[in-house]
Interface confidence: low
């Protein structure tokens, strides 16, 4: 048997107790790159975590969050409680958005309504805890013969915050 230590492939480790032979990672462990001296223990998706992808000899398990929670951090390192639209998560739990703010998602913070007057526009549709205001044309545009409304803004993709 040749010395394969420098060329042990992913899914194996260089076992110094066996004349530097590549040995397969034991069950519930993995090595995602070649030439490793040990295999890493597979991540276990327990509690608020659920398994999105099983561990294999060459890649770690990947976790998601159970219903009612969402992932935070790299590789879903934490699960944070969902709130309802119109709420934000505080240290004391989910709280309704204060007047003048909104949250259209189950995560994240309440954000201020758009100030239509900064753009010289008027409020066409009032904001709520769940939805931003809709700005309409400026008062000067509402002269006879002018259109009474602008087309609605395109909907944002889920999970994207306004810029």
């Amino acid at each position: 048997l040749q010395d394969l230590c420098s060329n042990c492939p992913a899914g194996t480790f260089c076992d110094n107790n066996r004349s530097q032979i590549c040995s397969p990672c034991p069950p519930n462990s993995f090595s995602s790159a070649g030439g490793q001296r040990t295999c890493d223990i597979c991540r276990q998706c327990k509690g608020v975590f659920k398994t999105r992808k099983e561990c294999s000899s060459t890649s770690n398990a990947e976790c998601d969050c159970i219903s009612g929670y969402h992932c935070l951090g790299a590789e879903c390192s934490m699960c944070e409680q969902d709130c309802k639209q119109g709420q934000e998560l505080t240290k004391k739990g989910c709280k309704d958005c204060c007047f003048g703010t909104f949250n259209d998602q189950k995560r994240g913070i309440c954000r201020p309504w758009t100030n239509c007057s900064l753009d010289g526009k008027s409020v066409l549709v009032n904001g709520t805890k769940e939805r931003d205001v809709v700005c309409g044309p400026s008062p000067a545009d509402l002269s006879p013969g002018a259109s009474s409304a602008t087309p609605p803004a395109p909907a944002r993709e889920p999970g994207h915050s306004p810029q």
Epitope: C8, P9, A10, G11, T12, S23, T58
Partner: antibody, heavy 116, light 107 residues
Amino acid sequence: DVQLQESGPGLVKPSQSLSLTCTVTGYSITSDYAWNWIRQFPGNRLEWMGYISYSGSTSYNPSLKSRISITRDTSKNQFFLQLNSVTTEDTATYFCARWGYVLDYWGQGTSVTVSS
Amino acid sequence: DIVMTQSHKFMSTSEGDRVSITCKASQDVSTAVAWYQQKPGQSPKLLIYWASTRHTGVPDRFRGSGSGTDYTLTISSVQAEDLALYFCQQHYFTPYTFGGGTKLEIK
């Protein structure tokens, strides 16, 4: 379901290169696992030739190391075998297969004869 | 390289019989042994890995055992569809190596 299909010429001349393609459906070759070539000689002896892993790293049988190359085309979900300087001893049925801890999915195999 | 030896090239049995196919490794492979079944004109199919773990969908009449250098595939009640070639393979050391095969024939 995961399926593998080998393709390539059935006849190769001695000293030339043997080139085979394995097309994988039902699973992305960049997602996980290692993607192998195995051959079965007349008389049924099986030989593991080597693999390319999901990350692109390769491992070859030392008996073939100077002649073998396994590459891939991730856009087509295919991986390839090239065996150089073939002789009549390379006449065999060539299989591609997926490797986790073991070879759990195999192609149907393609027969290659080396003859002038 | 590790040499995997299947001492019987052929084994003859009758339907309903119990049959054991053996495989010996040239050195300890720490239960990293798989068994494959190959029917005529088909590719090998995985039956057993880690010496005794049955692959998904494999009937429970197939059982693997062994440790160290000696491994056995047992078919508890042979069926006509079990007529096939059986290979052992070690998946502990590279290069991964196969036994020469045992052809199971039905009397």
